[in-house]
Interface confidence: low
């Protein structure tokens, strides 16, 4: 369990991730939760991966914003949009690949402030 905080006093929010593992060739979930906001339009979710230039996924103003998405994740990601309003920023990753393993950052912006937390994602053939 990793809990991250923003860096600017009262303008920080708590973001929580859980290290997880994905089965190669199946779908995976990268878990991330945050202090909810009452307005969906004020929430921005960004998923980033260490060593990857583009974004893994971005969700803002109530919908996906994938113009900056890295090619390796194109068409393979989704947030659970109906649950963002209650603080769920988890990412669904389709067709997990060996190369998806690594350190991910869940970065959240709301009207309350900003926060982020890292997540270690392992991939392999798990039973």
């Amino acid at each position: 369990l990793i809990i991250g905080f923003g860096i600017s006093g009262r303008h920080s929010i708590t973001v929580t991730t859980v290290a997880s593992a994905g089965n190669i060739g199946e779908d995976g979930i990268l878990s991330c939760t945050f202090e909810p906001d009452i307005k969906l339009s004020d929430i921005v979710i960004q998923w980033l991966k260490e060593g990857v230039l583009g974004l893994v996924h971005e969700f803002k103003e109530g919908k996906d914003e994938l113009s900056e998405q890295d090619e390796m994740f194109r068409g393979r990601t989704a947030v659970f949009a109906d649950q963002v309003i209650v603080g769920n920023a988890s990412l669904r990753l389709k067709n997990v690949q060996l190369t998806d393993a690594g350190t991910y950052k869940c970065y959240i912006i709301t009207s309350k402030g900003k926060g982020n937390a890292n997540l270690e994602y392992k991939t392999g053939a798990f039973s």
Partner: antibody
Amino acid sequence: QLQLQESGPGLVKPSETLSLTCTVSGGSIKSGSYYWGWIRQPPGKGLEWIGNIYYSGSTYYNPSLRSRVTISVDTSKNQFSLKLSSVTAADTAVYYCAREGSYPNQFDPWGQGTLVTVSS
Amino acid sequence: EIVMTQSPATLSVSPGERATLSCRASQSVSSNLAWYQQKPGQAPRLLIYGASTRATGIPARFSGSGSGTEFTLTISSLQSEDFAVYYCQQYHSFPFTFGGGTKVEIK
């Protein structure tokens, strides 16, 4: 073998909420390798994917229906359910539940389907 | 969303003949494509996934090919039980989408 069976009212009034349940038999809904989905087919037309749910409760909905759809799961009953609010005549369709593979995401097997008519 | 277009809308074929059905995606879906068969009053049945892999129990006369944006379902020798509507479905990107279907009817 795995079987899915839809159940629920066949007639719903406009502006009301359509509610259907899919009962899974011959296997556990808690299998980690599958999602559980809903697909609909208006009379004489093609198929439209509504959304799906993982046994943990994580959902993904078709953006075209997202504002009106809720899919939930009851692992103790081996069931998952669909609610579609504010229905109109355009929501009249055969509603199917199906198991969705966790990549490849093909649908197999399907329930036999249930016709829901929206009419006053 | 990715739009799937099937052609022709209706295909008239005699029993024993070959049927070739086409499915085109509005953008590349790699090999993330499935084919289904639907008979009147029945639920769809999975035939092919991964563009070319036959599902369990599907006869060898059904074959799928293609990748990217162009896909084909071939029924090598039509049997009476093959007359039905066929749908393609992409699972490359959310939301998953289906083609409009091709009805294979007896000539």
